[in-house]
Amino acid sequence: FVRTKIDTTENLLNTEVHSSPAQRWSMQVPPEVSAEAGDAAVLPCTFTHPHRHYDGPLTAIWRAGEPYAGPQVFRCAAARGSELCQTALSLHGRFRLLGNPRRNDLSLRVERLALADDRRYFCRVEFAGDVHDRYESRHGVRLHVTAAPRIVNISVLPSPAHAFRALCTAEGEPPPALAWSGPALGNSLAAVRSPREGHGHLVTAELPALTHDGRYTCTAANSLGRSEASVYLFRFHGASGAST
């Protein structure tokens, strides 16, 4: 299921005198497309241009991250008169052109979505025959990837004074809420750290002091589901103090 956010702009200005948009360069993309991790998403992009009946060589490009300078994730080229856009680059083989650039459509399909794909994408077209011209979407389309929670790490670590603390890190979108449960704990939200810079989908919760032996369970939940993982604390009281 792919959801596209349509721009329902309030009417700000006088009704315009319509000159045909086909006479100028423009690109139409939705502000946002949403899809679940593991699924596929379609990034729509259509354009108009001033070069009527252009059938020379063209290149279609999609970038990620930022316009004009971001890394290319997809590129294809069509020879003069050809409707086939031959793929020259498809990052990890997951990007495929759905649209026909000859018909002003650069729409892209992204397969097997991962949380790391959650970013902005920018379409670009280049004409290279008798006409040398190019155009790129400026604001791009934001691909919003949602995912049920997954606990990526759970561990017990030593603390000062022979104590122990537990850490639980989970990923998901929306970022999951984390809760710890365990001996003499009930249900505790613990010290939840905000998503880390550059790791927007990761959330970490710390249980600062494990006072009892037993099983400690971390639960991660968001609107798409929940996930659990447990660690066990057993202290062996030898000469060197407690250990796990």
Epitope: I6, D7, T9, E10, L12, L13, E16, V17, S19, P21, R24, W25, S26, M27, Q28, V29, P30, P31, E32, T48, P67, Y68, R120, D133, Y135, S137, R138, H139, R142
Partner: antibody, heavy 103, light 106 residues
Framework: CKAS????????MDWVKQRPGQGLEWIGE????????NYNQKFKGKATLTVDKFSRTAYMELSSLTSEDSAVYYC?????????????????WGQGTLVTVSA | ENVLTQSPAIMSASPGEKVTISCSAS?????MYWYQQKPGSSPKPWIY???NLASGVPARFSGSGSGTSYSLTISSMEAEDAATYYC?????????FGAGTKLELK
């Protein structure tokens, strides 16, 4: 730059500099829906754009101030953002903030 | 960057006179936008997407052009039109403004 009267997250917010008696210079823009920014290369490292969705406020922070930064700074809202064909230019402008840098 | 050159930089016109302000781009743009600014005030949207008048702009104003050459025209100058006019393009990064044309009443 506090916004009112429209859906704050639906429109990009831009910032424009105007030195005394001079023209307009575009600094950059931010999409309040996800805080994505696009800067004029000239102002990268000088200006940092942020938003607070809850208070519907856009912010610009200027660092390492010099006399060259003395100017009026405007926030301005684009008319639309789904494509450049529907882009209406800056339909709404703030009243401007005068920044004076003195030794 | 796409440099917008406005001409003339300063001009004066008598009431009733026709006025044309030009804006030349160093590379092709899809649409041109125009703003009016008076001393001590914020710029106001004046013409959007080359030829469309913003809300409240008198019908004596018009805009035209394509490619690298654009213009704003006042069919019959009035006192309230005295201001500085800026052109702006959005087709390439960074967004750029012209240096402005100061229109004075003769």
């Amino acid at each position: 730059c506090k916004a009112s009267g429209y859906t704050f997250t639906r429109y990009w917010m831009d910032w424009v500099k105007q030195r005394p008696g001079q023209g307009l210079e575009w600094i950059g823009e931010i999409d309040p829906s996800d805080s994505y920014t696009n800067y004029n290369q000239k102002f990268k490292g000088k200006a940092t754009l942020t938003v607070d969705k809850f208070s519907r406020t856009a912010y610009m922070e200027l660092s390492s101030l010099t006399s060259e930064d003395s100017a009026v700074y405007y926030c301005a809202r684009s008319g639309a953002y789904s494509s450049d064909y529907s882009y209406d230019g800056f339909a709404y402008w703030g009243q401007g903030t005068l920044v004076t840098v003195s030794a | 960057e796409n440099v917008l050159t406005q001409s003339p930089a300063i001009m004066s016109a008598s009431p009733g006179e026709k006025v044309t302000i030009s804006c030349s781009a160093s590379s092709s743009v899809s649409y041109m936008y125009w703003y009016q600014q008076k001393p001590g005030s914020s710029p106001k949207p004046w013409i959007y997407r080359t030829s469309n008048l913003a809300s409240g702009v008198p019908a004596r104003f018009s805009g035209s052009g394509s490619g690298t050459s654009y213009s704003l025209t006042i069919s019959s100058m009035e006192a309230e039109d005295a201001a500085t006019y800026y052109c702006q393009q959005w087709s390439s990064n960074p967004l750029t403004f012209g240096a402005g044309t100061k229109l004075e009443l003769k």
